[in-house]
């Protein structure tokens, strides 16, 4: 094996081209200059190297850049990106959206890998905030990306970026995440008129407070049951029967099918049965007539 470490005569690579796929592992190691490889990384992706050969090329780059690859190399990694570990990626400083897109393209069609998650984390931290262009890019590749962020990470999303969010991007968000996103969405869409505003804000309403739901009930929005069922229970409970009726419009009939599920179940328990009966839906479980309702939370606040 020792004599194999020298590059055979006439085999020294002058450029990165397809002839290299015929090089054995040790020949690639001995005959390809790491600096040449770094300057011609864009060619690697066009050459059908074997996985074993890609391992050798990665090793050469690792030796050349022990502190992490420069962005000029990162942008052209192509398939070699799939060889990188999260530890490798943590050494990188990626600032260009074009670089991010190029690497996400390589992973397209696959689930978000630890490598991709680390890359995105490095990129967003480097930018300081999740701007609209970045969010546009990330949600295009990974619709569930937004809901994978913690509430703390979501707090760095500027309201202007909310315009890039599609309803399906919020499908897997939990209430804590929507609590952070809703005020941003409210701010982003504040200049829109009633019906247009509702179309845009609808996906975010799982983070809306009671007062905003009361305001929406005055605007003939006809909220569908699927949206209503995603509302915060604590935001729905204080709504009156009249307000819920106005909020849902013709969809109010759907309450009957959902009467055993939250937040409808808990809301019914808080309403007077007389008021529920006015809906004509046969909803049961309200407060019987003649009972006095004590708001214990109010009592605690006063004490």
């Amino acid at each position: 094996e020792v004599e194999k470490t020298a590059c055979p005569s006439g085999k020294k690579a002058r450029e990165i081209d397809e002839s290299l796929i015929f090089y054995k592992k040790w020949e690639l190691e001995a005959c390809v200059d790491a600096a040449l490889l770094a300057t011609q990384m864009d060619r690697v992706n066009a050459i059908p190297f074997t996985y074993e050969q890609l391992d050798v090329l990665k090793h050469k780059l690792d030796e050349l850049y022990p502190q992490g690859y420069p962005e000029s190399v990162i942008q052209h990694l192509g398939y070699l990106f799939l060889k990188m570990s999260p530890e490798d990626i943590r050494k990188w400083n990626v600032t260009s959206l074009e670089t991010l897109k190029a690497l996400l393209e390589v992973n397209k069609g696959h689930e978000m890998s630890p490598q991709v998650a680390t890359l995105i984390d490095r990129f967003v931290k480097g930018r300081g905030q999740l701007d609209k262009d970045t969010l546009d890019t990330l949600t295009a590749f990974y619709p569930g990306y937004l809901c994978s962020l913690s509430p703390e990470e979501l707090s760095s999303v500027p309201p202007s970026s909310i315009w890039a969010v599609r309803p399906q991007d919020l499908d897997t968000c939990d209430p804590r995440q929507l609590d952070v996103l809703y005020p941003k969405a409210r701010l982003a869409f504040q200049n829109m008129n009633g019906s247009e505003y509702f179309v845009k804000i609808q996906s975010f309403l799982g983070g809306a407070p009671t007062e905003d739901l009361k305001a929406l009930s005055q605007q003939n929005v006809s909220m569908d049951l699927a949206t209503f069922m995603k509302l915060r229970t604590d935001a729905v409970l204080p709504l009156t029967v009249a307000e819920v009726q106005k909020l849902l419009g013709p969809h109010v009939e759907g309450l009957k099918a959902e009467e055993r599920h939250r937040p409808v179940r808990d809301w019914i328990l808080r309403q007077r049965q007389d008021d529920l009966d006015t809906l004509g839906l046969g909803l049961q479980g309200g407060i019987p007539n003649g009972y006095l309702v004590l708001d214990l939370s109010m009592q605690e606040a006063l004490s």
Partner: antibody, heavy 117, light 108 residues
Framework: SVEESGGRLVTPGTPLTLTCTVS????????MGWVRQAPGEGLEWIGT?????ITYYASWAKGRFTISKTSTTVDLKITSPTTEDTATYFC???????????????WGQGTLVTVSS | VFELTQTPSPVSAAVGGTVTIRCQAS??????LAWYQQKPGQPPKLLIY???ILASGVSSRFKGSGSGTEFTLTISDLECADAATYYC??????????FGGGTEVVVK
Amino acid sequence: SVEESGGRLVTPGTPLTLTCTVSGFSLSSYAMGWVRQAPGEGLEWIGTISTGGITYYASWAKGRFTISKTSTTVDLKITSPTTEDTATYFCARVGSSGYLFYFFNLWGQGTLVTVSS
Amino acid sequence: VFELTQTPSPVSAAVGGTVTIRCQASQNIKSYLAWYQQKPGQPPKLLIYEASILASGVSSRFKGSGSGTEFTLTISDLECADAATYYCQSYYAASSNAFGGGTEVVVK
């Protein structure tokens, strides 16, 4: 889809060319391989042609086979068949663009070559 | 010379049972191994790639595992339709691009 043709009975030493016709994808995006299977035996990789036209052969197949391609076909030439080359020859698409050695995710039905005097 | 050795062959089990097929590589091929199913008169069908990733449309009863030099394919809840010959294939390097000898699965 992938479809092989050209298989027939030949006498030893008579060159034979098999053709693989592809549709629904581009040969400029996928490498293609040839695999054979002798009657009652296992699968044997012969060689692969890259998107750029580079050919790579199994060590036992070098000199015995030649792979070439056009925009929609991939040919396998058996230069001087012997009785040991009697087999069903499959054409198969490499499972991802950009690789020469990879798994095969789309196969033809195969074409039978019989070499006998 | 690189070799992929499959064991055992043939292997038989009853409907509803489980079979395990092994594939041993003579060199480290990391996780670059695929499994195929072939029935008489048909071309091979890809089941698993990269040692454990299920190919599109393949039943989750098929499970691949292993890395380096030792790999296994496990078929659980055996059905009559699983009777076939199974092949492993490595694709890490040019020198190790090869198929295993095949393992016949008989379902009783």
